[in-house]
Every structure is written in C-alpha cells, then in structure tokens.
C-alpha cells in the first residue's frame, strides 16, 4: 500500500493576513486565525513528518480584501509560490479582472500548475493562453505519480468576467476524456481538483470513471468528523464518501473558506491505484499555531503599500452620501442607491442577446450601511471612507429566488417598521410601495421589478412563481437580520465580490458621483 497526504485550501479570498474567527479583520491577535504565515507553519510541519504530501488549492484565491484590490493577483502568485503549492484549480473569481488580470499576475508568475479541464480558449486568446493553464497535470510524488485534473464552475460567465473567448463546458463531459488520457498514460491515482460547489463535487465523484478523490471549492462547504473546533457547522463527515456508478467509494472534501482551516486527508492506495482507506479532518489554523517568521516578515513588507492605498482618492462625490441609520433604516437613502447601483454595475454580463443583462435587482439591508460620507471634504472618497460605510468585510452575492420569496422579504423589511431596525431594505431595479396602516405581513401594496429579458428596461409587476436573479449581501443570503426566508428558499447562491471593492471600483469608474433619492421606495398616502 502507498499513502498520500492531501493538504488543501479553497475560497481563500485574499485572506493573506490572519483574521478574526469570523474571517473579518483581525482585531485581537491572540484570538486570530488563518493567514499564509500560519498556514505555512502547519504545512511545513506536515511535510517534515510525512513522506508523500501534496498541497492543493481549489480556486478563488482572488477577491475579498484590500490585498486583491491593490495587488490584483500578484500577491496570490507570490505567497502561493512561497508556500510551494503543488497545484491550483481555477475558480470563478480568478476571472474578476478579466483574462488579462489572470494571465499576467497569476498564470505567468505561478511556479505551480494551474488547472481546468472544462475551460476551452478560442479565437486569438487560444494561442496567447496556450500552456498557461492545463486540463491535467501528472505530479511525481515519492516513487509514484499522481494525476490531478481541474475543473471550474460553468456558471463563471455569469459570476465573473472571463470574456467571450473562453468557453466553459459541462464539468463531467469535459473531465471524462482527460481522466481517460491519464489512465492511458498508466496514471492510476487521480484527484479531481476544482471549483464548482459541493453538489457538483459529489456528481463528479459519482459519474467520472477513474477519479479516486475529489477536492472541491466554491460552496464554502465545511465537513468534519467528530466535534467541530470552531463556529462552523459541518454539512457532513470528512471525507464525505460517495459511491460511484461503478461501485467505488470516492472521498470528497472541501475546507470551508478564507484560509481558516487546512484540509488534511490521508489516502491509502493499493498497488493498482485503488483507494483502500481515507481519513482526516480540516485543521483549524488558530493562534496555537505560530505564524512563520519569514512569511510574516514578507507579509509586513507587502502590507506597507496597502496602508498608503487606503487614503488615496478613488473619486469624488458632489452630494452628501446619506448613510445615516436615521435615513437608511426608515426610507430610501442615496447611499443605499449608490451601493445598489454599484452592485448591479459590477454584475453587468452580456451573455445572451435576448437579455440586456442577466440580473437587474439588488436588495441591501439598511443596517449594513454604517456611515455617511460628507461631500464637504473636497468631495474626496477614499477606501478608508468606504470601510467605515461597509466595515464587515462581506461580499455582494448572486442568488436566484422565486417572486414569492422576494415578496416575503419585503414584508419582513417593514414588519416592525419604526424601531430603527436593520432589516429595512434599500433597493436597485425595484420599485416598492408600502402601506404601513396595514398589518405586518400585508404591507407591500406594490412591487415592480426591472425586466432583464428586454431591450428597453422597464418595471413590471413581480410574478410570484417566476424565478428572479438578485444581487444582495452574503449576510442576507445567509438569513441575516431575520431574512430566514431567503436562506431557506433560495434556489441558487454564488458568492460574489468584496463589498468595498464593488463600490470603490464603481466610484473609480464614474469619477464623479451624485446619487439621488428617486422614488425607489414609497409609502402610500396617509400611512407615513
């Protein structure tokens, strides 16, 4: 028998520095977790102790903190090289800055193979990107070789900016011939490493003949066997075992997100490459694990540029940006409008001639807007200003909801109106009218939404049975501020870009902003 140790991360999302337990900015260092310096300590410890070790990443290193905003992926290549990753799969967020924003900082600089079997380049891009990412890689490990085949969510064109010269094929259809090639080459230990979410990971384990292990990402799935060490609730045991259609037991793993855990899976193979046993657990990277001094010093060196950036002007406002709780928790506020407009702008994807855009709607809990920005400071808006407005380090995500769920959400928005509570919704691409004289649960008297399947966008009444795409904070997608109906009834959820980054990019693009209160939210006569 031959034993392989797979160390894995996924959805790290720019968490190069250690974070608090909830993966936001580290405040009390003695209770902080993760970060590449701490990760390196643990990885090196395992490499020294065990003979056959692979360190793999299942995508979405890009996007999530000011590190990515400033360094644009160069930080990913630099620190992944320093940690000596063996391979990485492309995630959807790796395309956030377009194909050029992937090629130059990461694909050309990475010292490890970057993989995806279901992304096919065409046109002029084909020769430019040739060899910079691969469908699979054969890696020598000890006296054996291991094949790693990559995959990426086929929804990427709706979630990021891969452009028109990359085709995202069905994962299973694309993986099978590449696995067959590895088998042809007498590679009999094969890992599928990719970024399509836990449901697809399980399908790959079930359907792709020849895959021995699946290491996934995208859905931030936490798996654990035994008593979990922190706040994350396991979605199942680690590894999660899938019985394949040809009767094999295939371990599937994922390691939550944000570099909080290091996935640790031990696989035993027989001489024919069959999995005999698999066991392990994610390792919580808490403060009991010291940060590696040399990596930490490098982080501190790179950090200097971030501090300079946060005080630089992104753009100007010529109006007061009202982000006060007195406004945003009671009525339409122009800070809410600005943020929602930025959220929609960040999701402009012309992927179908029938649609002017794939999504037109935004909702945003007023309680998530934490500060106004005064225009009387020469109109200057900095990252620092935006960090005061959006201090929680969240993301603006894409969900699919039925009209009936949206109606419930808007009823919840005003079910206890007047108490300055955070659930009051700010909107974009939505016109809502409330009648507060009616009883809670029946206060939405008009709810019109901007069409997407139209050449001239206009507002139409919400249809209860129709499925709509909506951009919203991850906080709401996870049922925050009492929006349990969103969490319980959402049909799809894809995590998006860092909230501050979305707004800062929009302001930089617009240069000068002047958001107004324009009648998106109204109250019917006599009730307010």
């Amino acid at each position: 028998a031959w034993e392989l140790t797979i160390l894995h991360t996924n959805d790290v999302h720019s968490r190069l520095e250690q974070t608090s337990e909830d993966s936001s900015k580290c405040v009390n260092a003695s209770r902080c977790m993760g970060g590449v310096a701490r990760l390196f300590t643990k990885v090196q410890q395992i490499r020294r102790a065990e003979p056959n070790v692979l360190l793999l990443d299942a995508g979405d290193q890009y996007q999530g903190t000011i590190w990515f905003t400033v360094y644009k992926g160069a930080e990913v290549a630099h620190f992944m090289n320093a940690l000596r990753y063996d391979a990485m799969a492309l995630g959807n967020h790796e395309f956030d800055n377009g194909v050029e924003g992937l090629i130059e900082p990461l694909l050309k600089e990475a010292k490890f193979p970057i993989l995806s079997a279901n992304i096919k380049a065409k046109g002029p891009l084909a020769s430019q990107i040739s060899g910079l990412y691969l469908p699979y890689k054969v890696l020598p490990v000890g006296d054996e070789v291991v094949g790693i085949v990559g995959y990426t969510s086929k929804e990427t064109p709706f979630l990021s900016n891969p452009g028109t010269n990359l085709v995202f094929e069905d994962e299973i259809t694309a993986l099978q011939p590449e696995v067959d090639k590895l088998k042809t080459l007498n590679v009999n230990k094969i890992i599928a490493l990719g970024h399509s979410g836990f449901e697809m990971d399980k399908l790959i384990a079930q359907k792709v003949r020849g895959v021995d292990v699946v290491v996934g990402g995208h859905s931030n799935t936490f798996l654990y066997t035994g008593n979990p060490p922190s706040k994350e609730v396991p979605a199942g045991k680690y590894p999660f075992i899938v019985t394949s259609d040809d009767g094999r037991k295939v371990p599937v793993v994922q390691a939550y997100a944000f570099g909080k855990y290091l996935g640790y899976l031990k696989i035993e193979f027989d001489e024919r490459g069959n999995v005999i046993s698999s066991h392990g657990n994610p390792i919580l990277l808490n403060s009991s694990i010291p940060e590696d001094p040399s990596i930490k010093a490098d982080i501190n060196k790179w950090r200097i540029k971030l501090d300079n950036y946060s005080t630089q002007e992104l753009g100007k406002t010529i109006v007061y940006l009202d982000g006060s709780s007195q406004s945003c928790r009671f009525r339409e506020c122009n800070m809410g409008n600005l943020i929602c407009d930025a959220m929609i702008n960040n999701n402009l994807r012309h992927t179908d001639e029938m649609f002017w855009n794939h999504v037109s709607m935004c909702i945003l809990n007023g309680g998530g807007i934490r500060s106004p920005i005064d225009e009387r400071n020469n109109g200057t808006i900095t990252w620092e200003n935006l960090a005061a407005v959006l201090p929680f380090g969240g993301t603006f995500d894409l969900v699919q909801l039925k009209g009936s769920t949206l109606k419930k959400a808007f009823e919840h928005s005003v079910h206890r109106y007047g108490q300055s509570t955070g659930e009051f919704l700010q909107v974009g691409g939505i016109h809502v009218v409330y009648d507060l004289s009616r009883k809670p649960g029946d206060r939405v008297v008009k709810l019109d939404v901007l069409c997407t399947k139209c050449r001239v966008p206009s507002y139409d009444p919400l249809k209860m049975d129709e499925v709509y795409k909506v951009i919203l904070p991850n906080f709401l997608a996870n049922g925050g501020d009492g929006f349990q109906m969103i969490k319980d009834e959402l049909l799809r959820h894809d995590s998006g870009d860092q909230d501050i980054n979305v707004v800062s990019t929009y302001i930089s693009k617009m240069k000068v902003i002047y958001p107004a209160v324009e009648g998106r939210i109204k109250f019917s006569t006599g009730s307010h």
Partner: antibody, heavy 118, light 107 residues
Amino acid sequence: QIQLQQSGAELVKPGASVNLSCKTSGFTFSSSYISWLKQKPGQSLEWIAWIYAGTGTTRYNQKFTGKAQLTVDTSSRTAYMQFSSLTTEDSAIYYCARHVNWDHFEYWGQGTTLTVSS
Amino acid sequence: DIVMTQSHKFMATSVGDRVNITCKASQDVSTAVAWYQQKPGQSPKLLLYWASTRQTGVPDHFTGSGSGTDYTLTINSVQADDLALYYCQQYYRTPWTFGGGTKLEIK
C-alpha cells in the same frame, strides 16, 4: 518566448565524463519536465530520462541507468545531464526537451554534439 | 519496449500532393502518439499529439489519425517547406520510443 539553450559541442576521450547543460526561459520551469534524448547521425531518437524540475524527481530509460544522471538548478532555470564512462557509442547529438506532462515533447533545445574519440 | 515502425524510410511527393506517413506500434498505444518534423541541422518540432491534436501554431494542412496500433500523419497539399524527416513517438509506456523516421522528398 520559450527557449532551451544548450551548451556547446564537446570532444572528450573514452572513459571520461561530460556535463551537458540546458538553460531555459519563457515558461514555468518548476512545473515542467525536462527530458534528454539522443540522436546518432542519420538515426532516430532515443529517450534517455526525465527530471521534474520542481522536485528533482527522475525516471530513466533502463538502458541509460548508471550512464546518465540528471539534475536541475532552479535558481538559474538550468537542467543538467552528466554522462559518464564514455565510449565511442555515446557520440551523438543530445537534446533537452520540455514537456508539461508525461507525454509529448513540446519544445526542444538546439542540441549538443558530443564526440567521444581518443 | 514498444517498437514504433515507420515502414517507409523515404516518400517521394510533389508540391500540392496529399501524402500519408504511417506508423505501426508493436502493441496498442491508445492514441498516445505524437508526430515530429525535423529539418537538416535542426532539432525536432512537435506537430501533433494524442494522435490528432494539432500543436499551437502548426499549419492546418497537417492532420493526424489512428487508434490501437496504426497511426497516420497526413499532409494535405504538400508545400516545399514540408520537405523534412517525420518521426512518430509513443508515450503510452516508458521507455518512450520513436519510429525510425520517414523522409519526405520531392519526386
């Protein structure tokens, strides 16, 4: 662009050893395989061995085990092949070639002519 | 070791002709076959791999086919620049082995 620059021609005596080099540029060295191949004048090609630059792992054609030894220097992005106990049969052109997987040789060096003669 | 046999050491052709260069493996190599072109005084150049996949930048008048033990490199409408030695190679099992080569000449 991708380049593999091999060292110059060598004239050596039987029984001696020689160290051939292959300096690379334009691709990710550490995640590449470098193979060495032999071609005698007017003849076909013979694969000698490969080395995975990232780890220094090697695999040899049994015929060349003990004769060839492959190493890499990642800092200079250079692959080396030491050829020992030379005989006249070892006179040939030696190529280094880069491949990303266990398969075809994508890019080749220009070749080094080795002449073993007393 | 797997033996790759190119039965024609030489093939005579004219510019504009279509030519088939064949290669036979001593056992099934499951399309793990590459083709190379070598001109005098130059190193080999990859044309095709996995029997039929054209390497980036290779003109599309080079095509490959085959399965099992029999493989063919087809040059549609031969050009003067195509006159060279052509080798097949199997990478199904180590040691990787090459055919003896086929020299394409002008009639």
